[in-house]
Interface confidence: medium
């Protein structure tokens, strides 16, 4: 008798659909060549397939097999008009599953997902379940069409990461899932506004968002010109706004404000504030004479170009002597003074057409 | 379809306590967050407590109004929610309402009311 | 606390007429980050508990006769019907569920004329 073929092996690609046959050739010498039958089981509909090779081969492959269905494969040694027993095998070729499920469009109670739907005529569409993550008992469930790519999963929880499979269904059967996990958003607070400004001081108020299930607010401010130097307050989810002390003066600040819930924090609402100049400080007086005196200060922490020096007599209602000098000085000596007279001196240090606050100071001729 | 059914209302002498209940059927209770929504007579609605699903740690939420008197509690096994309430007031005469949140815990609309139960507090 | 104002408090009105009623909120409750506005609206018949009709303020809930429409955004809204059934004759409230506390309206009654 004819010795069969050993070690068949088979393999279905799910992405292409096509099943490729293989076998260890037959030990009898001078054989015409092999015969390869498919057919599905137990009298299943679904095409019987079959193929004749040379002699010199050892695999073949077959299109067009039903995803999901089963087939017994049978290799036969062929010899003239006499056939050996086959070697025979079982596949059920898998159900092509998606390979390109990415994820759009996330909001607070929303996730949109999209697909390239699989060119395959047995595929009658795609079935999509949600699961929270840690959860077992899918909370969603829902059937598309074959055509269909996108979908949006909607009522879903804020900040909570969900299980989201993709499974391609064919007439009795089904692919194995995709499955991918998200996150839904927590929504942002909104209005950002700065109030109240002062050269150390600034008030930040928000909108929260329409939400009384937020953990906090997270508050982080820093220097624009040095990001890494970062304050956090985490402030009561009932209040929405906040006074940051003990800042540079003179100083631009990034300020992001984030809700947060159950840990989870949502995208920042920014903004930009520059915090005002300080007054220079310590006035002081020397060199008193009848018509002239000079006036020494402390120059303020913020960054300035200049100070500007107004003087008049104390009860005197017209306008007051002005001078300016440059940054890198913190004196003046006012001169063509009345002799036995009690003087007001203003300081304030300029950065550009931006003014300080008045340093105040009195002396007498 | 949806059902709540409350039970247990009745009447109560002031600074007495009362037990209500809520019977779900038709919907996946341990998924949703419960409310009970309250109107006195002749009156418009309040609402009056909240509890999240077992995912939200079963996080409660109370009206002001009934802060550490009342108490709301559920048991997914048996698809019931609860309104303890203790130290009544004459002003908590009310029919209470069972109430499913609809959309998710950001979206406190209620998309399914039971019938009520009616709480009279009086001596 | 967000307040709920609702005027007229009671419409007395004929069948087939057009019916309209207000709601205004004293804080907005328009999120711009998604351009919603957290309202409802709830149907509430002699001896019934509340049904609801609206969401978001303008969203019909599933089931709902296409006569009753909500709409306005910010702090005014309106619940109209477009054509009353006899079977619309009760009370309607509205509610906002933009922030803790919950609050409804007073209510506006619709009576028959």
């Known amino acids: 008798p004819l010795s069969p073929p050993t070690n068949l092996h088979l393999e279905a690609n799910p992405d292409t659909g096509v099943l490729t046959v293989s076998w260890e050739r037959s030990t009898t010498p001078d054989i015409t060549g092999y015969r390869i039958t498919t057919t599905p089981t137990n009298g299943q509909q679904g095409n019987s397939l079959e193929e004749v090779v040379h002699a010199d081969q050892s695999s073949c492959t077959f299109d067009n097999l039903s995803p999901g269905l089963e087939y017994n494969v049978s290799v036969y040694t062929v010899k003239d008009d006499k056939e050996s027993v086959p070697i025979s095998d079982t596949i059920i070729p898998e159900v092509p599953q998606l390979t390109d499920l990415s994820f759009v469009d996330i909001t607070d109670s929303s996730i949109g997902l999209r697909w390239t739907p699989l060119n395959s005529s047995t595929i009658i569409g795609y079935r999509i379940t949600v699961v929270a993550a840690g959860e077992g008992i899918p909370i969603f469930e829902d059937f598309v069409d074959s055509s269909v790519g996108y979908y949006t999963v909607t009522g879903l929880e804020p900040g909570i990461d969900y299980d989201i499979s993709v499974i391609t269904l064919i007439n009795g059967g089904e692919s194995a899932p995709t499955t991918l996990t998200q996150q839904t958003a927590v929504p942002p607070p909104t209005d950002l506004r700065f109030t109240n400004i002062g050269p150390d001081t600034m008030r930040v108020t928000w909108a929260p968002p329409p939400s009384i299930d937020l953990t906090n607010f997270l508050v982080r401010y820093s220097p624009v010109k040095n990001e890494e130097d970062v304050a956090e307050l985490s402030i009561s989810p009932s209040d929405n706004a906040v006074v940051l002390t003990n800042l540079l003066p003179g100083t631009e600040y990034v300020v992001s404000v984030s809700s947060v819930y159950e840990q989870h924090e949502s995208t920042p609402l920014r903004g930009r504030q520059k915090t005002g100049l300080d007054s220079p400080t310590g006035i002081d007086f020397s060199d008193i004479t009848a018509n002239s005196f000079t006036v020494h200060w402390i120059a303020p922490r913020a960054t300035i170009t200049g100070y500007r020096i107004r003087h008049h007599p104390e009860h005197f209602s017209g306008r007051p002597r002005e001078d300016r000098v440059p940054h890198s000085r913190n004196s003046i000596t006012l001169t063509n003074l009345t002799p036995g007279t009690e003087y007001v001196v203003s300081i304030v240090a300029l950065n550009g057409r931006e003014e300080s606050p008045l340093l105040i100071g009195q002396q007498s001729t | 379809e949806v059902q709540l059914v409350e039970s247990g209302g009745g009447l109560v002498q002031p600074k007495g306590s009362l037990k209500i209940s809520c019977a779900a059927s038709?919907?996946?209770?341990?998924?949703?967050?419960m409310n009970w929504v309250r109107q006195a007579p002749r009156k418009g609605l309040e609402w009056v407590a909240r509890?999240?699903?077992?995912?939200?740690?079963?996080?409660?939420y109370y009206a002001d109004s009934v802060k550490d008197r009342f108490t709301i509690s559920r048991d997914d096994s048996q698809s019931m929610l609860y309104l303890q309430m203790n130290n009544l007031k004459t002003e908590d005469t009310a029919m209470y309402y069972c109430v499913k949140q609809g959309g998710n815990s950001l979206y406190w609309y209620f998309d399914v009311w039971g019938a009520g139960t009616t709480v009279t507090v009086s001596s | 606390d967000i307040v709920m104002s609702q005027s007229p408090s009671s419409l007395a009105v004929s069948v087939g007429e057009k019916v309209t009623m207000s709601c205004k909120s004293s804080?907005?409750?328009?999120?711009?980050?998604?351009?919603?506005?957290?309202l409802a609206w709830y149907q509430q018949r002699p001896g019934q508990s509340p049904k609801l009709l609206i969401y978001?303020?303008?969203t019909g809930e599933s089931g709902v006769p296409d006569r009753f429409t909500g709409s306005g955004s910010g702090t005014d809204f309106t619940l109209t019907i477009s054509s009353v059934k006899a079977e619309d004759l009760a009370v309607y409230y509205c509610?906002?569920?933009?922030?803790?506390?919950?609050?409804f309206g007073a209510g506006t009654k619709l009576e028959l004329k």
């Open positions: 509890i999240r699903s077992k995912s939200n740690n079963y996080a409660t």
């Open positions: 509610q906002q569920y933009y922030s803790y506390p919950l609050t």
């Open positions: 804080q907005s409750l328009l999120y711009s980050s998604n351009q919603k506005n957290y």
């Open positions: 038709g919907l996946t209770f341990n998924t949703y967050a």
């Open positions: 978001w303020a303008s």
